[in-house]
């Protein structure tokens, strides 16, 4: 009973988490204009993974997609990839876990098969959650770096009194949705892995048979098979950073550097 509850809860938590990852990936508010120095702007900028938007005081909102692939920063591409991988793994995990649920009977599926499927889906949820958390964290780090870079040269003097205020971006709602969703998927995955241990048969369906010898008594009890899975991680962290060097064409072309972070 506890195993079924753990498995079911793990499935529901993962489902909510993956829905959240999908929502975060689609959201436009990954980064929003920092209003610290200008709380009463009549033009509010915010950006997502796929497009940047401007909401005007008039109520009009204009969004433009990033119609270039090669022109986008490598970090943004990496974040997109991580989120998509997270969604794909999560979706496959959900599909597998549906068939693995103890409360669902499919033909004469063995408990060992269900245990393996539960473990597989659990691992997929864990990786999916980690992908989402990593993606959101990479984007957040990119925002922090650019925030302090733009703060350093926030006001560029243009002949005395005139000032050009550079738009700074801060964390958008999508980042928090992504972190929470990734965490939920991760927790759901862990729960599925825990449930797997309870599903795996500790002993065979045959009763233990005792053989009584004349001199001494020996009981033979066939033992259950336990499978352990080990994970090896050999991820190399490579810092990809765009120092801000731009060709003349890049400076003039739309979208600008600040449209993605």
């Amino acid at each position: 009973m506890a195993v079924t509850a753990c498995q079911g809860l793990g499935f529901v938590v993962s489902l909510i988490g993956i829905a959240g990852i999908i929502a975060a990936t689609c959201m436009d508010q990954w980064s929003t204009q920092d209003l610290y120095n200008n709380p009463v702007t009549a033009v509010f900028n915010y950006q997502g993974l796929w497009r940047s938007c401007v909401r005007e005081s008039s109520g009009f909102t204009e969004c433009r997609g990033y119609f270039t692939l090669l022109g986008l920063p490598a970090m943004l591409q990496a974040v997109r990839a991580l989120m998509i991988v997270g969604i794909v793994l999560g979706a496959i995990g959900l599909l597998v876990s549906i068939f693995a649920l103890k409360c669902i009977r499919i033909g004469s599926m063995e408990d060992s098969a269900k245990a393996n499927m539960t473990l597989t889906s659990g691992i997929m949820f864990i990786v999916s959650g980690l992908c989402a958390i990593a993606g959101v964290s990479v984007f957040a780090n990119m925002l922090v770096t650019n925030f302090w870079m733009s703060t350093a040269n926030m006001y560029t003097g243009m002949g005395g009194m005139v000032q050009t205020v550079q738009t700074r971006y801060t964390f958008g709602a999508a980042l928090f949705v992504g972190w929470v969703a990734g965490g939920l998927t991760l927790i759901g995955g862990v729960m599925m892995c825990i449930a797997c241990r309870g599903l795996a048969p500790e002993e065979t369906n045959y009763k233990a048979v005792s053989y009584h010898a004349s001199g001494h008594s020996v009981a033979y009890k066939p033992g259950g098979f336990k499978a352990s899975t080990g994970f090896g991680s050999n991820t190399k962290n490579k810092k990809i950073y765009d120092g801000g060097a731009r060709t003349e064409d890049e400076v003039q072309s739309y979208p600008s550097k600040h449209d993605y972070v």
Partner: antibody, heavy 120, light 113 residues
Amino acid sequence: EVMLVESGGDLVKPGGSLKLSCAASGFTFSTYTMSWVRQTPEKRLEWVATIVGGGGYTYYLDSVKGRFTISRDNAKNTLYLQMISLRSEDTALYYCARMGLTQRNALDYWGQGTSITVSS
Amino acid sequence: DIVMTQSPSSLSVSEGEKVTLNCKSSQSLFNSGNQKNYLAWYQQKPGQPPKLLIYGASTRESGVPDRFTGSGFGTDFTLTISSVQAEDLAVYYCQNDHTYPLTFGAGAKLELK
């Protein structure tokens, strides 16, 4: 045809109060952000206050903050400006204006204005 | 607050003449998010409310004659009337539409010579 008609202007004593109204017609009032702009006797234009379509956000000129309140009744298609603690520098012709949806926050339609004179 | 400075404050012109009115803002009115400049130009004739001519620094409002042209970027903007007509004699105001308070320039009065 878009029409904005202001009313409520009067001669008031310093410290007095007044409520201006602006009746709108010819467009879906609730969709548009509305503003009050005043023109001083020296013919200078001065933005006073803005209220967004749903009424959730309001913006004010610093010198009128706490004294003026912009509000709207979308059911009656009417914009209001409640003014208290009036000063002599509030003497002006008050215009009600509509912020165009696709006009980059520019005021695309204006009323004929209502005059306020603050004098003892 | 963003200060809008207009020049000249008044201008005497002959009919058919080309006129250039300038407007300078103390801060950039350019928005990087959509690559637009948030500046408007208005025309006010005696006894009438202001009328929108140009928005987004260069977009002509519908119904405005094509002799009116807006240009500029960031902090420096221009309103050009290619061939002044008698009906163009009025006061012209520029306005910051980027940041509250939405400040106006002092105006430029166009008079007949």
